[in-house]
């Protein structure tokens, strides 16, 4: 429960939230679990801690490992673990299973596909969407806030959908992509 798997691609931004949440006033310290070395909070570092978030801007394969977060209230200290894996970018279109977020189901009445993890990032529209690596075009597809709406859903709409957006941190831009499967169910 308090160990969370997170993954990303090299040279993209990855932001990980401490799985142990506390009240906003509580402080959060982050450590490399293997060395118990504190992770810096200064934003000039490529990897730095920002309250309950650990930011990899951008991520590198060597960042993979387990990170410890300790949330401190005036009287209690509670520990969480973030298991981070950074993968090399695939040269082909195929998205391996280990990079996929949870599958979502849709129907003619409800066809929203949320972009996974986007709430952790400082992003601005537009959000780009791809299906099986092809940019989505046509009036049936509407990118709305952090999700994609498909009008008049058909069984052929099933597949892997990737959202792509830009995270901005102190004026610097970093790309983020996330992929999940979409299945179509009968009403």
């Amino acid at each position: 429960k308090f160990s969370k798997q997170s993954w990303g691609l090299e040279n993209e931004a990855l932001i990980v939230r401490c799985p142990r949440q506390g009240k906003p006033s509580y402080t959060v310290d982050w450590y490399y679990s293997q060395t118990n070395k504190s992770i810096p909070t200064q934003e000039r570092n490529r990897v730095f801690a920002s309250r309950d978030r650990l930011k990899f801007l951008p991520a590198a394969v060597a960042d993979s490992g387990i990170y410890t977060c300790i949330v401190r209230s005036p009287t209690f200290n509670r520990t969480g673990y973030a298991n981070v894996t950074i993968y090399k970018k695939q040269s082909d279109c195929n998205v391996p299973d280990y990079l996929m977020y949870s599958t979502v189901s849709g129907s003619e009445k409800n066809s929203k596909i949320y972009c996974p993890t986007i709430d952790l990032y400082n992003w601005t529209a537009p959000l780009e969407w791809f299906k099986n690596c092809q940019a989505l075009q046509g009036s049936r597809y509407r990118a709305h806030k952090s999700f994609l709406v498909i009008d008049n859903v058909m069984t052929e709409d099933a597949g892997d959908y990737t959202c792509k957006f830009i995270h901005n941190e102190n004026g610097a831009n970093y790309s983020v992509t996330a992929t999940r499967s979409f299945t179509v169910k009968d009403e």
């Epitope: 429960k1 308090f2 949440q21 506390g22 009240k23 209230s73 209690f76 509670r78 520990t79």
Partner: antibody, heavy 123, light 107 residues
């Protein structure tokens, strides 16, 4: 210093009603989840009900659902438990306690407890 | 609901001895388990949270261990004031549940 002081207990007939109060002091009451726990004579502890801080979401044990109502008045730093349709098996010492951590959707331990108020349901 | 079973029901020991109390959950509670001490006529007092962390002001002779379904509270050397009833509690999900208690009495 954190203090919780229950009141309102007493003898009541089966089917009757009672309202317990818990006056809190020494901490910012509104941001903490609050809980009622009871203990029947010579028995163990039983969670009765919880209420979130400012959000006010409520949770009940099956044994009291539909009969008991937990509420709070953050302006008065007071927690309440309205008990209706009381039964003999509701006889217990009722404690109010503080959850010092909870975030939405989670629970934690009880770090401060009141001294308890005895509710006796008998004819 | 998650049922917590404590054993033994009663533990008869002398001051200075080691006490080992067990709490078993009917399903995994990860480390969302606490231990409380209760003396006659008093409210419970928090000893251990998150299975193994001592609450503020609790002496080092109290320690907790375990995760998942099996947990242990150990009192390394009993002091006269440690004779009391001890309860475990899970808080992974509502309803919050307590064990039935273990009474540590003087032999």
């Amino acid at each position: 210093e954190v203090q919780l002081l229950e009141s309102g207990g007493g003898l009541v007939q089966p089917g009757g009603s009672l309202r317990l109060s818990c006056a809190a002091s020494g901490f910012t009451f509104s941001i903490y989840d609050m809980i009622w726990v009871r203990q029947a004579p010579g028995k163990g502890l039983e969670w009765v009900s919880s209420i979130r801080g400012e959000g006010g979401g409520t949770y009940y044990a099956d044994s009291v659902k539909g009969r008991f109502t937990i509420s709070r008045d953050n302006s008065k730093n007071t927690l309440y438990l309205q008990m209706n349709s009381l039964r003999a098996e509701d006889t217990a010492v009722y404690y109010c306690a503080r959850d010092p951590w909870s975030t939405e959707g989670s629970f934690f331990v009880l770090d401060y407890w009141g001294q308890g108020t005895l509710v006796t349901v008998s004819s | 609901e998650i049922v917590l079973t404590q054993s033994p029901a009663t533990l008869s020991l002398s001051p200075g001895e080691r006490a080992t109390l067990s709490c078993r959950a009917s399903q995994s509670v990860d480390d969302d388990l606490a231990w409380y001490q209760q003396k006659p006529g008093q409210a419970p007092r928090l000893l251990i949270y998150d299975a193994s962390n001592r609450a503020t002001g609790i002496p080092a002779r109290f320690s907790g261990s375990g995760s998942g379904t099996d947990f242990t509270l150990t009192i390394s050397s009993l002091e006269p004031e440690d004779f009391a009833v001890y309860y475990c509690q899970q808080y992974i999900t509502a309803p919050l549940t307590f064990g039935q208690g273990t009474k540590v009495e003087i032999k």
